[in-house]
C-alpha cells in the first residue's frame, strides 16, 4: 500500500526494528539468541530465550537440562519440550520405589503372587502388584511342575501376563542394576502370575520362539522366551521388533522382551506419516529454526516449504531477501520428499518391520 511506504521506510531505518508486511506494522527485532513469542513483537518482553536441545525453559526463565531416561530400567513417558522436562518412568514390569522429580531413582520388578494368592491389583509404573487370597476352587497353579503344562484346549486362564505382588517375593527388594540382559532375565522370572499358561496356547515352533522350560519347582517361570529381535506382545505372541535400519531413522527405544524397538526420524527431520512403532516417512523439518541465520520476522506469514534436500540435510535456511519475500525456489512438498511408495499400505503392522530406505535400498 503506498500509504504504508513512509512508515515502512522509517521502520527499516531503525536497526532494532523491522517492518512486517503481513500485519503492516513495525516490529521489535529480538536480539540474537532470543525467540519471538508472537508474530510481531513490540517490546523486549515479547522475546524469550531459546534453549539448547535437551534443555527446557523452566518457570524461572532458566534453561535447565531435561532428565535422562537412559538407565536400563527407565522409559520415556513424555519427551523433552521447550518448556517442560522429559519425564521418565519405570519400564513395563517394574514399579518406582524411590521417586524423584520427573523420574524414578529406583525401579523394582513387580512381585509374583505366591501359591494360593491371586492378583488383586496389577502392578503399574508407580505401584507394585497387590495380591489377595485365591477364592475357593482356584487351584494354585505352578505350585508343581505338572501344573505348568501347556493348556490342552484353546482356553486361556489369564489372557496376558499380569505382574503381581507381595513382599513375600524377593522381587520387591531387587533393584535393576545390570544391563538389558539382566533386565530381560530377571523380568522373565517375575512377570507371569501363577495360573497363566506357559505359552498362551501357541505351539513352540512359532517364529521367534525359544523352547520354554517347565516351571522350576515352586516358581512362576512360565513365560515363553522369544528369539532375539522378537518381543512378546500383549496377546502372548512372539512378534518381530521393527527395524530402524533405514538411513533416516534412529532407534529411540531398544527391542525388549515385552516391547518392540521404537524408531524415530533423525534429528532435523519430522515424521510426516507414521507407522506402528516407527515412522514410514521422514522429511526434513520444513521451518528453519530462528537461530539458523534466516530472518524469521521478515518471513512472517510466508509459506516455508522446501525442495527435498538429500536425506540428512536441513532445508535451505539462508537469509531471505530484505523485502520479506521468500526465495522463488522455495516451493517444496512433503509428499515428494521421500519415495511415495513408503506409505501406501499403512499402517504397517508391527510384525512387518519396515526397512524402506530413502535411497531406494
Amino acid at each position: 500500500f503506498p500509504q504504508d511506504r513512509p512508515f515502512e521506510d522509517t521502520c527499516r531505518g531503525n536497526p532494532g526494528h523491522y517492518y512486517d508486511k503481513a500485519v503492516r506494522r513495525c516490529c521489535y527485532r529480538c536480539p540474537t539468541g532470543l525467540f519471538p513469542t508472537q508474530q510481531c513483537p513490540q517490546r523486549p518482553a515479547d522475546c524469550r530465550k531459546q534453549c539448547e536441545p535437551d534443555y527446557y525453559l523452566d518457570e524461572a526463565g532458566r534453561c535447565t537440562a531435561c532428565v535422562s531416561c537412559s538407565r536400563d530400567d527407565l522409559v520415556e513417558k513424555m519427551p523433552c519440550a521447550w518448556n517442560s522436562s522429559r519425564v521418565c518412568e519405570c519400564q513395563p514390569g517394574m514399579f518406582c520405589a524411590v521417586s524423584v522429580v520427573n523420574s524414578c531413582a529406583r525401579c523394582f520388578f513387580h512381585s509374583v503372587c505366591p501359591a494360593g494368592m491371586i492378583v488383586k491389583f496389577p502392578g503399574t509404573a508407580q505401584k507394585n502388584t497387590v495380591c489377595e487370597p485365591a477364592s475357593p476352587g482356584v487351584s494354585p497353579a505352578c505350585a508343581s511342575p505338572e501344573n505348568c503344562k501347556e493348556p490342552s484346549s484353546g482356553t486361556i486362564p489369564q489372557a496376558k501376563p499380569t505382574p503381581v505382588s507381595p513382599a513375600t517375593s524377593n522381587a520387591s527388594t531387587m533393584p535393576l542394576r545390570g544391563g538389558t540382559r539382566l533386565a530381560q532375565e530377571a523380568a522373565s522370572k517375575l512377570t507371569r502370575a501363577p495360573g497363566s499358561p506357559s505359552s498362551v496356547g501357541r505351539p513352540s515352533s512359532d517364529p521367534g520362539l525359544s523352547p520354554t522350560q517347565p516351571c522350576p519347582q515352586g516358581s512362576g517361570d512360565c513365560r515363553k522366551q522369544c528369539e532375539p529381535d522378537y518381543y512378546l506382545d500383549e496377546a502372548g505372541r512372539c512378534t518381530a521388533c521393527v527395524s530402524c535400519s533405514r538411513d533416516d531413522l534412529v532407534e529411540k527405544t531398544p527391542c525388549a522382551w515385552n516391547s518392540s524397538r521404537i524408531c524415530e526420524c533423525r534429528p532435523g527431520m519430522i515424521c510426516a506419516t507414521s507407522a506402528t512403532n516407527s515412522c514410514a516417512r521422514c522429511v526434513p523439518y520444513p521451518i528453519c529454526a530462528a537461530e539458523t541465520g534466516t530472518k524469521p520476522q521478515d518471513m512472517a506469514e510466508k509459506d516455508t516449504t522446501f525442495e527435498a534436500p538429500p536425506v540428512g540435510t536441513q532445508p535451505d535456511c539462508s537469509p531471505t531477501p530484505e523485502n520479506g519475500e521468500a526465495p522463488a525456489s522455495t516451493s517444496p512438498t512433503l509428499s515428494s520428499l521421500v519415495d511415495s511408495q513408503a506409505s501406501k499400505t499403512l499402517p504397517i503392522p508391527t510384525s512387518a518391520p519396515i526397512a524402506l530406505s530413502s535411497t531406494g535400498k
Epitope: N83, R266, C279, I287, P296
Partner: nanobody, 122 residues
Framework: EVQLVESGGGSVQAGGSLRLSCTAS????????MAWYRQAPGNACELVSI???????YYTDSVKGRFTISRDNAKNTVFLYLNSLQPEDTAVYYC????????????????WGPGTQVTVSS
C-alpha cells in the same frame, strides 16, 4: 504435563468449511512451533500443517491452498481453517506442541489431546 484440547470438528458436505481450535492448558503457548496432524480410520497419522512462533507456516501438499493455520499466543490457541473440504479430509485432527522435538516418531496423533473428528460427505 502438556495438555491440549482440540475442538471445532463436525460433519460437512464436500466443499464446506470448518474452523478447528487447539487450546493449551498447563503450559504457555509461545513456544517455537505448533503442528496439526490427522488420522483417518485404519490409516497412518499424517502431518498436515505447522506454524512457527513468528507466524511462518507450512502445509503438506494435499491441503495447500485449502487449509490455513494461525495462532493466538495471548489466548493459548492455534487454529486450522479447513476450506473446500473433500471426503478424503475425513479424519480425527490432532494438534501437537513443538513438533521439531516431539514429532520425530510416529506418535503425534493423540499424545496430547483427544482430537476432533472431521467428517466430509460427498
Amino acid at each position: 504435563e502438556v495438555q491440549l484440547v482440540e475442538s471445532g470438528g463436525g460433519s460437512v458436505q464436500a466443499g464446506g468449511s470448518l474452523r478447528l481450535s487447539c487450546t493449551a492448558s498447563r503450559f504457555t503457548f509461545d513456544g517455537p512451533d505448533m503442528a496439526w496432524y490427522r488420522q483417518a480410520p485404519g490409516n497412518a497419522c499424517e502431518l498436515v500443517s505447522i506454524i512457527s512462533a513468528d507466524g511462518r507456516t507450512y502445509y503438506t501438499d494435499s491441503v495447500k491452498g485449502r487449509f490455513t493455520i494461525s495462532r493466538d499466543n495471548a489466548k493459548n490457541t492455534v487454529f486450522l481453517y479447513l476450506n473446500s473440504l473433500q471426503p478424503e479430509d475425513t479424519a480425527v485432527y490432532y494438534c501437537a506442541p513443538d513438533p521439531r522435538r516431539n514429532c520425530r516418531g510416529g506418535y503425534c496423533c493423540g499424545n496430547w489431546g483427544p482430537g476432533t473428528q472431521v467428517t466430509v460427505s460427498s
